[in-house]
């Protein structure tokens, strides 16, 4: 709970409201510190900041609520009710509440631990969201090589909008026991699976860190094996020298795969969202948006009117594909009973033709024996290559023997012919190797994603068990952490491989790699933060968690050190790789010039049970430096691009921005005139927790 501020003196708890779409809103009972359901029994998630403020005022009529602000971290709330249901379900949901601010704004009193610094930033020319100022605080701390420990808003200038931020930065070492307690928040994650994602929603539905689950779906009790069996990993972190991908592809211990309702419902929701028709809505703005076209299996552009519509409505093609692309292709795969690892693999364009030796491997979908299949294909390829080379060398010898009596020029021509033939065979082999490696890597990635998804599901299920079993939670967390570690390791190795064979391409994909690593980092910390929402469990397994994370930290350091010092990477058989002597230059794995530093690759922290791990950016697309991208729409209902007040929609025939030469009359149009009144709406972004389960 937030410490009550001056405005709430005498109250046991701070007034807050929490929303979870499809359930009745909750508000904090300030007398007893418990969450109560909506008193009217009718109100569910509200999609504007104004609405949230108004709702705060309704549920706390005796308090003078003047503003709202997102809480810095999520909370677990039980007993969410459905409209018209007498009994409320006890299944908890993790949501980020909104704090209802009382009276004149008073900034939060932040604790400044020893060796930490209190800082603040005010900009009278800026009026921005909690997300923006959180990002400012985090980046300021980063610039000083410190971690953001806590933060609070300053100088309100609108509903949930501020002109400044106060924050505490702590040295990286100190932060080992208190990592960005503020950062568990799903910053960018508009809960787009809530009601219609209208343009004026300003992303203000509660940010859900867990994922929506359908009440109708029966709760599936996981048939758990004995705890000791849970721990039987066969999965320790030491690298097998032979094959960097080997560990990433070893056979999974078969975990009982009774899918949790959590994942099921998220996937259902995503499928539902992505299969909706593109809907312009009632307003007349022409906002360029993207929707997932099920028939085409890809995202397509459409014009959105600015209000109404549905959730199949994305700001960019990348977001659209991130959300729907994989989810829809997976759902198609599922319906045809294909395992996830069998995603079609993009083959490199370099391979002129698919050689027989590799045919079988390339045409057989990946499975849990991927590594063995890969090894076999490698061996077949090398054997075939050796055989063809011997054949050519034999032909060459024979030709040279016959050319003994020929003129010098003809001898030269024979030599040249065979040199070219050898070179062409080498090139062909190199292409085939490249194709093989890329196919292997793509399959490994699919499997890693699959495993991470499963591990995350099992971990969340373990956390949600009533009562939760700490040992089981720890074992599931351990598996999940390993899965993330492997993803990270795979990403780095993939990048290094590309850097070795095609430095130009490596430069192009560098930012994607950086983003992917950051996504892993954020998702990892987000997932860890869930543990701290179940304090009883967190306390009991704290030491093991610390140890686990320390182990992983050390391992990460090693991997990175190797990546930096070793310009080469072995795929288990160097004959597989083309000669790369010329590329053995200074290693530039990732730039360290402010664009990216090794710290960005360190997701492992040890922290106390009272803290929550960091999660700040939550980007699922390549990182955009702008703190709150696409600040295109306003917090005012129906205003911004449509410039129409909702009350007046009936009067306004068409937005003036698009009616120039039409015969329409527009009356009493009220604009959002000041830029500071423009809110931020990220459109349909799904948070990393969901990303962990659905997208990645």
């Amino acid at each position: 709970l937030e410490v009550p501020t001056d405005g709430n003196a005498g109250l046991l708890a701070e007034p807050q409201i929490a929303m979870f779409c499809g359930r009745l809103n909750m508000h904090m009972n300030v007398q007893n510190g418990k969450w109560d359901s909506d008193p009217s029994g009718t109100k569910t998630c509200i999609d504007t900041k104004e609405g949230i403020l108004q709702y705060c005022q309704e549920v706390y009529p005796e308090l003078q609520i003047t503003n709202v602000v997102e809480a810095n971290q999520p909370v677990t709330i039980q007993n969410w009710c459905k409209r018209g249901r007498k009994q409320c379900k006890t299944h908890p949901h993790f949501v980020i509440p909104y704090r209802c601010l009382v009276g004149e704004f008073v900034s939060d009193a932040l604790l400044v631990p020893d060796k930490c610094k209190f800082l603040h930033q005010e900009r009278m020319d800026v009026c921005e969201t909690h997300l923006h100022w959180h990002t400012v605080a985090k980046e300021t701390c980063s610039e000083k090589s410190t971690n953001l420990h806590d933060y609070g808003m300053l100088l309100p200038c609108g509903i949930d909008k501020f002109r400044g931020v106060e924050f505490v930065c702590c040295p990286l070492a100190e932060e080992s026991d208190n990592v960005d307690s503020a950062d568990a928040e799903e910053d960018d994650s508009d809960v787009w699976w809530g009601g219609a994602d209208t343009d004026y929603a300003d992303g203000s539905e509660d940010k859900v860190v867990e994922v929506a689950e359908e009440e109708e779906v029966a709760e599936v009790e996981e048939e758990e094996a004995d705890d000791d069996e849970d721990d039987e990993d066969g999965d320790e972190v030491e690298e097998e020298a032979e094959e960097p991908y080997e560990e990433a592809t070893e056979r999974t211990t078969s975990i009982a795969t009774t899918t949790t309702t959590t994942t099921e419902s998220v996937e259902e929701v995503v499928r539902e969202v992505c299969s909706e028709q593109a809907e312009t809505g009632p307003c007349r703005a022409m906002i360029s948006r993207w929707y997932f076209d099920v028939t085409e299996g890809k995202c397509a552009p459409f014009f959105y009117g600015g209000c109404g519509g549905n959730r199949n409505n994305f700001d960019t093609e990348e977001y659209c594909m991130a959300v729907c692309g994989s989810a829809m292709s997976q759902s198609l795969l599922k319906t045809t009973q294909e395992p996830l690892a069998r995603d079609p693999v993009k083959l490199p364009t370099t391979a002129a033709s698919t050689p027989d030796a590799v045919d079988k491997y390339l045409e057989t979908p990946g499975d849990e024996n991927e590594h063995a299949h890969f090894q076999k294909a490698k061996e077949r390829l090398e054997a075939k290559h050796r055989e063809r080379m011997s054949q050519v060398m034999r032909e060459w010898e024979e030709a040279e023997r016959q050319a003994k009596n020929l003129p010098k020029a003809d001898k030269k021509a024979v030599i040249q012919h065979f040199q070219e033939k050898v070179e062409s065979l080498e090139q062909e082999a190199a292409n085939e190797r490249q194709q093989l490696v890329e196919t292997h890597m793509a399959r490994v990635e699919a499997m890693l994603n699959d495993r991470r998804r499963l591990a995350l599901e099992n971990y969340i299920t373990a956390l949600q068990a009533v009562p939760p079993r700490p040992r089981h939670v720890f074992n599931m967390l351990k598996k999940y952490v390993r899965a993330e570690q492997k993803d990270r390791q795979h990403t780095l190795k993939h990048f290094e491989h590309v850097r070795m064979v095609d430095p130009k391409k490596a430069a192009q994909i560098r930012s994607q790699v950086m983003t992917h690593l950051r996504v892993i980092y954020e998702r990892m910390n987000q997932s860890l933060s869930l543990l701290y929402n179940v304090p009883a469990v967190a306390e009991e397994i704290q030491d093991e968690v610390d140890e686990l994370l320390q182990k992983e930290q050390n391992y990460s350091d090693d991997v990175l050190a190797n990546m930096i010092s070793e310009p080469r990477i072995s795929y288990g058989n160097d004959a597989l790789m083309p000669s790369l002597t010329e590329t053995k230059t200074t290693v530039e794995l990732l730039p360290v010039n402010g664009e990216f530093s090794l710290d960005d690759l360190q997701p492992w922290h040890s922290f106390g049970a009272d803290s929550v791990p960091a999660n700040t950016e939550n980007e699922v697309e390549p990182v955009d430096a702008r703190p709150a991208a696409d600040r295109g729409l306003t917090t005012r209902p129906g205003s911004g691009l449509t410039n129409i007040k909702t009350e007046e929609i009936s009067e306004v025939k068409m937005d003036a921005e698009f009616r120039h030469d039409s015969g329409y009359e527009v009356h009493h149009q009220k604009l959002v005139f000041f830029a500071e009144d423009v809110g931020s709406n990220k459109g349909a972004i799904i948070g990393l927790m969901v990303g962990g389960v659905v997208i990645a």
Partner: antibody
């Protein structure tokens, strides 16, 4: 119809005080940042004060900081400007504005 | 503060002529959401300023189509294709991208 109606202007002596009011109608007052803008006898327009929609934040240029206070009562759809320590250079036509809509103005004359 | 510089100060025209007024801002008025918060107001004699063009080129309610706005970043232009008697008055450019809201010095459109 969007309407902004100012009142409270008049003649005051230097050092004196005055409170201007602006009654708003025809739109959801509590949704919009509101401003007081003045027009000097030379016809120059200058922002005097600005207040966010909830009243949680205000802005004043240095010329009036500490002397003028902007406030609003969203329940009454009214904007206020409390002026004190008035100077002759504050003489102007004062407009209440929501950016796209302006009132008809009220005149303040500061003179001894 | 963002300084808005308007030219010319005075523009004598004949009815039916085309008129053009320029305005330059001291910094970019492009907001991070991609919109440019630059506007034109017209103040007719004895009246308060009225919004004419908002966000560079959008005509406000009831504004005839002989008025058009253009420009980007820091340079903007207002054009009146055929000046009519009711168009006479002082034209102000304005920006609301940055706090505080600021205005140009005005251009007086008058009959030759």
């Amino acid at each position: 119809e969007v309407k902004l109606v100012e009142s409270g202007g008049g003649l005051v002596q230097p050092g004196g005080s005055l409170k201007l009011s602006c009654a708003a109608s025809g739109f959801t007052f509590s949704d919009y940042t509101m401003s007081w803008v003045r027009q000097t006898p030379e016809k120059r327009l200058e922002l005097v004060a600005e207040i966010s929609n909830t009243g949680g934040s205000t802005y004043y240029p240095d010329t009036v900081k500490g002397r003028f206070t902007i406030s609003r009562d969203n329940a009454k759809n009214t904007l206020y400007l409390q002026m004190s320590s008035l100077k002759s250079e504050d003489t102007a036509m004062y407009y209440c504005a929501s950016g796209d809509y302006w009132g008809q103005g009220t005149t303040l004359t500061v003179s001894s | 503060d963002v300084v808005m510089t308007q030219t010319p100060l005075s523009l004598p025209v004949s009815l039916g002529d085309q008129a053009s007024i320029s305005c330059r801002s001291s910094q970019s008025l492009v907001h991070s959401n991609g919109n440019t918060f630059f506007h034109w107001f017209l103040q007719k004699p004895g009246q308060s300023p009225k919004l004419l063009i908002y966000k560079v080129s959008n005509r406000f309610s009831g504004v005839p189509d002989r008025f058009s706005g253009s420009g980007s970043g820091t340079d903007f232009t207002l054009k009146i294709s055929r000046v009519e008697a009711e168009d006479l008055g002082v034209y102000f450019c304005s920006q609301s991208a940055h706090v505080p809201w600021t205005f140009g010095g005005g251009t007086k459109l008058e009959i030759k």
